[in-house]
């Protein structure tokens, strides 16, 4: 069934019904050079063939030039993310030219019509870039197109149509409907710029996916798996507004891509790292925290150029707000025996203790099942920098947290009524930090006591022999 979309109807209806009553207007695209960090400043409008505004408004031919391209609009006004992004670019790149591509009249239409207008707008941008290329010292290599939602595909068209190759395109949650699975010349793709990096924050495998699911760049980054963004759940939205709606959730998750990019501009000292992985499930298992062979990268503005032969899907976890950076850890727990496990999977929590801080109690997400006589890998992440890890507390939760687990426990009891206590043996935990690439091994405090059972905890300290595998470092990322 269709996803509801607030009090005004369903999501599908929103895609086909702009709020404005339309009148016949000539299609128009404007280029506004943002000459001030003050969002209220009117800036300077540039037009092909007119050199005077370039001089009057101090367009810097040798500097970087950013083109910000908005997406489909229901209101016909620039949304608030725009001036946040403009301001962040001005802060980070003081000499740069920041140009807003205003295609509101063509975007404030039925979604399907707006999609059909993306090609025209891409052409307009390409014409502007071709004209600028005629000027001395202007280089396409210094051009960075930043497109949000439908604007990402506009950027793709612009990169495709321009004479030459633009330096970079960043796609901020490129639009999904009518682009998913489309031919590479009808959507953003790696051949549209020298470097195409993409952030996917609202992808859905069910219902309507506002953002495109497929990889469309040289690197495609899927924060939090590219779907459910922290701080954007209905509960979070309900907490911040009197009557939260699905609309707010959609906006929050879709726009999260913009905020992650803004964060990368203004919180340069707190870079977020993403790690290459074949899929979200493997990442959740903690398998993919390597920086070898360009397998990790900064996200957003600080991303290092990678031109892979095929798309590189990368994943990371984030906080719910700026700064978004978290610290990722891979935990390898070797379970060498267990007793009377029954059907039910244990619920484990870890607390990490470091030289800088201690973590909260973190759940170990069991993606499939706990394997015995095998190494089980988990991903945990902390919001604070713990420093060097000193010890780990592993807790096996006692009482069942769900009716399903309770039922399984009850069934286990019926089949084995005199079931002795469930128990599991763990000697050591191997930990790898995603951010520093350091690996450490932690042993049980008491080598004689390696068993853990429901409601109990086990403490691990750095092994006495200081067992440490050689550090992996990445050539593409300056690790903090």
């Amino acid at each position: 069934s269709p996803v509801p979309f607030g009090p005004e109807g369903r999501l599908e209806d929103k895609l086909h019904k702009p709020k404005a009553t339309q009148t016949e207007v000539k299609p128009s695209v404007r280029f506004n050079l943002r000459t001030s960090k003050d969002p209220e400043h009117e800036g300077c409008y540039l037009s092909v063939g007119h050199s005077q505004p370039l001089e009057d408004c101090s367009f810097n031919m040798t500097a970087k030039t950013f083109f910000i391209i908005h997406g489909w609009t229901m209101s016909g006004i620039f949304e608030n993310w725009l001036h946040k992004l403009v301001s962040a670019l001005h802060t980070r790149e003081k000499d740069a030219n920041v140009v807003v591509v205003d295609w509101l009249p063509l975007a404030h239409q039925l979604y399907t019509d707006a999609v059909n207008n993306t090609r025209v707008v891409g052409h307009s941008i390409a014409r502007m870039l071709d004209w600028l290329q005629e000027k001395d010292d202007f280089s396409l290599g210094n051009v960075h197109l930043i497109g949000y939602s439908l604007g990402a595909h506009v950027a793709g068209y612009a990169g495709n149509f321009v004479k030459g190759t633009v330096g970079r395109i960043t796609g901020l949650d490129p639009a999904g409907p009518m682009f998913e699975g489309a031919d590479i010349h009808k959507r953003l793709s790696p051949d549209d710029a020298d470097f195409v990096d993409v952030l996917h924050t609202y992808t859905r495998s069910f219902g309507l996916s506002i953002g495109i699911q497929m990889p469309v760049g040289h690197i495609d980054i899927y924060p939090n798996g590219g779907d459910f963004q922290p701080g954007c759940g209905l509960n979070d939205v309900l907490g911040s507004i009197a009557y939260g709606t699905i609309t707010e959730v959609v906006k929050c998750e879709h726009e999260r891509a913009v905020h992650l990019f803004v964060d990368s501009l203004v919180n340069q000292d707190k870079p977020s790292f993403a790690f290459q992985c074949t899929d979200s499930n493997r990442f959740k298992k903690g398998i993919c925290l390597s920086c070898r062979k360009n397998r990790c990268n900064s996200i957003g503005y600080n991303a290092k150029k990678m031109r892979n032969k095929r798309n590189s899907k990368m994943y990371l976890k984030t906080r719910a707000g700026m700064p978004f950076r978290v610290y990722h850890y891979q935990m390898k727990i070797h379970v060498f025996s267990y007793k009377n496990m029954g059907e039910i999977e244990p619920t484990f929590y870890v607390t990490l203790y470091g030289t800088n801080a201690d973590s909260q109690t973190l759940p170990l997400e069991i993606v499939e099942r706990i394997e015995q006589n095998a190494t089980n890998t988990f991903l945990v992440y902390t919001e604070e920098d713990l420093g060097d890890l000193l010890k780990i507390q592993l807790t096996w939760e006692g009482a069942s947290q769900s009716w399903y687990n309770l039922w399984k426990e009850f069934r286990s009891y019926l089949s084995q009524p005199r079931n002795p206590g469930r128990e599991l043996n763990i000697r050591r935990i191997r930990v790898k930090s995603g951010e520093t690439q350091r690996k450490l091994t932690f042993c049980t405090e008491d080598p004689e006591n390696t068993s853990i059972s429901p409601g109990r905890e086990l403490w691990f300290r750095k092994c006495r022999d200081g067992w440490r595998m050689k550090n992996e470092t990445s050539p593409t990322v300056e690790l903090p």
Epitope: Q22, T23, E40, F78, W81, H83, P105
Partner: antibody
């Protein structure tokens, strides 16, 4: 200096049409959006909608869809509000007010207001 | 639509004292650290004049005795010290990026 100058007071009968003008000066007309706001006698302010002064695309608040029309004469830096099939409840002062496309959408300059009286 | 509720509907303040006007929104008007709440002053027979934008920023040419504060759903306009010429009706106005934009019901300030 920046000014929005509106046309004078109007006295109309129910069923008639009125067209109120708002002439802008002191800035580039097409670089700012234009709002229309209604204030009935002794009542609060009610946002009617806005028009994109570059593209001419109007957006109407729900209560002002149908009989109300925003238009432009860009060459004269003038925005218009037309109300068709006037009703007694249209009696009010109508203000035009500009806002920045790129900013936080507050209304920084207002016209002096046009008083419309609808009476048989 | 976001509903703005102003209180009190009217108040009388002595010259030189503080006037405090409250505006409560039916849902948050915040976005990424900014509050899209504005305040206007309207005197009889005149158009409204911008006093405060984005919750706490002073409009052009507005004296420093006017100040705004608040975030989320609760906002306040303070005038201190109140002067004779401040007798007017004050309106709050939300300008989030999802119109319709709405105004509060107004607060009439009288100087004693």
């Amino acid at each position: 200096q920046i000014q929005l100058v509106q046309s004078g007071p109007e006295l109309k009968k129910p069923g008639e049409t009125v067209k109120i003008s708002c002439k802008a000066s002191g800035y580039t007309f097409t670089n700012y959006g234009m709002n229309w706001v209604k204030q009935a006698p002794g009542k609060d302010l009610k946002w009617m909608g806005w028009i994109n002064t570059y593209s001419g695309v109007p957006t109407y608040a729900d209560d002002f869809k149908g009989r109300f029309a925003f238009s432009l004469e860009t060459s004269a830096s003038t925005a218009y509000l037309q109300i068709n099939n006037l009703k007694n409840e249209d009696t009010a002062t109508y203000f035009c007010a500009r806002f920045s496309y790129y900013g936080r959408h507050y209304f920084d300059y207002w016209g002096q207001g046009t008083t419309l009286t609808v009476s048989s | 639509d976001i509903v703005l509720t102003q209180s009190p509907a009217s108040l009388a303040v002595s010259l030189g004292q503080r006037a405090t006007i409250s505006c409560k929104a039916s849902q948050s008007v915040d976005y990424d650290g900014d509050s899209y709440m504005n305040w206007y002053q309207q005197k009889p027979g005149q158009p409204p004049q911008l006093l405060i934008y984005a919750a706490s920023n002073l409009g052009s040419g507005i004296p420093a005795r006017f100040s705004g504060s608040g975030s989320g759903t609760d906002f306040t306009l303070n005038i201190h010290p109140v002067e004779e010429e401040d007798a007017a009706t004050y309106y709050c106005h939300q300008s989030t990026d999802d119109p319709p934009w709405t105004f509060g019901g107004g607060t009439k300030l009288e100087i004693k």
